[in-house]
């Protein structure tokens, strides 16, 4: 049976018999009998429970160095077996043993739950020598005990390579319940059941759990820890906590918010970062996610033009990053742009619409009726064309780009010329004689360079040839342009 010493109990004696320093005669463990007697007990009796055989760890009797006498077995005296106290109290307990003086260099060590206690522990060993035996008291004290001090403490003594072990002293530190698992915040679907878990431990046990929702206790009857609360469903946000109580008091867990998933709020601050003739780069600030991660977003684009049919172009994109390049737009056009994002519950409303414009585009058609002829006297090539019929979206014509390629005996050289928008003719110097010159012309606006016209070739003869017939682009649908000599 365990001897219990509650904190309110009177201090227990260090020894069951007289104080150390005198021979112990009553409740003796026979260690104090003169070792010259040769008496060897077969059993050791517990001093706390006389008449019951003691089966603790004892040192086997052995012959002395003189070889003449037997020594009785050595064993620690019984002390209190179980100490129960509250957290933050102080505790002191001890082991005692009487050792015949024939033994030298006896040391006592303290062990807790199988591990030796070293270093910064308050352990004191006192020696009380007598004629034939020395009473040794090893005291262990803990100030302001904590739960971590709970455990089984024993003394060990080494004599002549033999180890003597005391009975365990169980220290039980009692306090308020301590949470090992607390409820966690969750985001849940409306009217859908979910579970919360709470677990707390003593000592003392049992620990009982009450659940609290929005400051109201949910269960009239406590549940033994651990407890799982099944909530059948919520229609609005709620705060849950659990209260754990034992015979020492009550501890409350952290309060956790259970949120109801909803559609996201609309994105805000849609911004234009870059516009080209056919694309617009936008960004946005996501709205509140409705307690559910964003899945994707939708960019909605409407052309702002009285003549347009008002249709909406929809571009789906990932929710992150919060940017999207809208492509396939018309040049020099006005658009209204909005963004909506979705989570598992549904789509948000559309963000406030913003206006954006594309820039001028490059011309989409080449100059017409390109004609090339040689003005041999001046060593020049004359080029003439007609202004292309560009759309408004291409913007204002700023000029033309002329590409002329000279090919002769395996050598090829391309040159580019720029001329103003008011011109419809140009002259270029002959670069090489006895060569072919291929001419293409493209219209240029602020939006860029349009497509080049079909190539027109003219042969530049060696010096002495005379032929001023022009070359020109054919009418639409004709074969490739030919050189007219």
């Amino acid at each position: 049976a365990i001897t219990e010493a509650r904190e309110e109990a009177k201090p227990y004696p260090l020894f069951p018999g007289p104080l150390p320093g005198s021979l112990q005669t009553d409740h003796t463990s026979l260690l104090s009998l003169p070792h010259t007697s040769g008496y060897q007990p077969a059993l050791m009796f517990s001093p706390t429970q006389p008449g019951r055989p003691y089966t603790g760890n004892v040192a086997i009797p052995r012959v002395t160095s003189a070889g003449s006498k037997l020594l009785p077995p050595l064993a620690f005296k019984h002390t209190v077996g179980h100490i129960i106290l509250s957290e933050h109290k102080d505790v002191k307990f001890n082991c005692s043993i009487s050792v015949p003086n024939i033994y030298q260099d006896t040391t006592i060590s303290w062990w807790k739950d199988g591990k030796e206690l070293l270093g910064a522990h308050h352990a004191i060993t006192q020696f009380y020598p007598d004629d034939e035996v020395t009473a040794i008291i090893a005291s262990f004290s803990i100030t302001s005990v904590q739960r971590s001090d709970n455990g089984s403490y024993i003394c060990k003594m080494k004599i002549n390579n033999e180890e003597i072990v005391s009975d365990p002293i169980y220290i039980e530190v009692q306090g308020l319940p301590h949470f090992t698992k607390q409820p966690e915040s969750m985001n849940v679907t409306r009217n859908t059941a979910f579970n919360l878990t709470c677990q707390a431990v003593g000592p003392p046990e049992p620990v009982n759990i009450f659940w609290v929702q929005n400051s109201s206790r949910v269960n009239e009857q406590p549940e033994k820890s651990p407890s799982v609360l099944t909530v059948p469903g919520l229609t609005e946000m709620a705060v849950f906590s659990c209260e754990a109580h034992n015979d020492k008091g009550l501890t409350v867990s952290k309060g956790v918010q259970i949120n109801i998933k909803a559609i996201p709020s609309p994105p805000t601050e849609v911004s234009i970062h870059n516009s080209t003739a056919h694309s617009i780069l936008i960004s946005w600030v996501p709205g509140f996610d409705g307690y559910s991660p964003f899945r994707n977003c939708s960019v909605q684009v409407k052309e702002v033009d009285p003549l347009s049919n008002g249709s909406v172009m929809i571009f789906n994109t990932s929710a992150s990053p919060h940017m999207y390049q809208i492509k396939q737009l018309q040049a020099l056009a006005n658009y209204s742009i909005g963004v909506s994002c979705m989570n598992e519950i549904g789509w948000s409303a559309v963000s406030p619409w913003i206006l954006a414009s594309t820039t001028e585009g490059a011309p989409s058609v080449a100059p017409l009726n390109v004609t090339v002829f040689l003005n041999e006297s001046r060593d020049n090539v004359d080029i003439r064309w007609m202004k292309p019929l560009t759309k408004r979206q291409a913007g204002e014509l700023v000029g033309y780009r002329i590409s002329h390629v000279w090919q002769s005996a395996g050598i090829s050289k391309e040159l580019l010329e720029e001329v103003g928008q008011n011109n419809s003719r140009a002259q270029i110097s002959v670069q090489v004689h006895n060569a072919t010159c291929t001419v293409r012309i493209a219209a240029v606006t602020k939006g860029g360079v349009g497509p080049f016209s079909d190539p027109v070739k003219i042969f530049i003869p060696a010096h002495g040839w005379v032929d001023h017939a022009p070359s020109s682009t054919p009418a639409p649908g004709n074969a490739d342009p030919v050189l007219i000599i």
């Epitope: 003392p204 400051s215 206790r217 009239e220 209260e243 109580h245 015979d247 008091g249 009550l250 409350v252």
Partner: antibody
Framework: QVQLKESGPGLVAPSQSLSITCTVS????????ISWVRQPPGKGLEWLGV???????DYNSALKSRLTISKDTSKNQVFLKMNSLQTDDTARYYC????????WGTGTTVTVSS | QAVVTQESALTTSPGETVTLTCRSS?????????ANWVQEKPDHLFTGLIG???SRAPGIPARFSGSLIGDKAALTITGAQTEDEAIYFC?????????FGGGTKLTVL
């Protein structure tokens, strides 16, 4: 639903002892500590003592020498015994759940008179 | 032993908010005093309203709330109703015993 019901003798002679039983239903005494409280006529409430789930007890220090609280968990009953009653022990005696004083019995009136 | 003090009587009107307080002679009331509020109605009917960590007992209307205000425990009734007319006792736990206040008689006119 948790319910507590007190039963007592009603009339006790001075210097005699009082025994009251609190019968608990809807909950096990192994998970509910029970306190005893009394209210003298026209006065406030006075806490008498508690019996813990593990069977330990704590008492009002002014009454400790005269009080004993015990329980029979198998019958779900808690017992209050008070010795050496005097006329100022006349009161209505209640048992109540402990950490939350939210479940009370209806009480039993005890009159100390010769 | 600690003495727990409450207002002896308070009067309020239906729909008004009223706060009852509970003071300890030993100093500030803390969470470890587990302030409990108990309502007494005629015919010895006691009902616990608030306990533990200022949580309402099951079935107690949300207009009753417990808190610690300054160095006192408080019971606030937000939007008092005529049926709230009663005597309200506060109880504080001191390590190993409860101490009850003298009670506050609340009248709802």
């Amino acid at each position: 639903q948790v319910q507590l019901k007190e039963s007592g003798p009603g009339l006790v002679a001075p210097s005699q002892s009082l025994s009251i039983t609190c019968t608990v239903s809807g909950i096990s005494l192994s998970s509910f500590a029970i306190s005893w409280v009394r209210q003298p006529p026209g006065k406030g409430l006075e806490w008498l003592g508690v019996i813990w789930t593990g069977g330990g007890t704590d008492y009002n220090s002014a009454l400790k020498s005269r009080l004993t609280i015990s329980k029979d968990t198998s019958k779900n009953q808690v017992f209050l015994k008070m010795n050496s009653l005097q006329t100022d022990d006349t009161a209505r005696y209640y048992c109540a759940s402990h950490w939350y004083l939210d479940v009370w019995g209806t009480g039993t009136t005890v009159t100390v008179s010769s | 032993q600690a003495v727990v003090t409450q207002e002896s009587a308070l009067t309020t009107s239906p729909g008004e908010t009223v706060t009852l307080t509970c003071r300890s002679s030993t100093g500030a009331v803390s969470t470890s005093n587990y302030a409990n509020w108990v309502q007494e109605k005629p015919d010895h009917l006691f009902t616990g309203l608030i306990g533990g960590a200022n949580s309402r007992a099951p079935g107690i209307p949300a207009r009753f709330s417990g808190s610690l205000i300054g160095d006192k425990a408080a019971l606030t009734i937000t939007g008092a109703q005529t049926e709230d007319e009663a005597i309200y006792f506060c109880a504080l736990w001191f390590s190993n015993h409860w101490v009850f206040g003298g009670g506050t008689k609340l009248t709802v006119l």
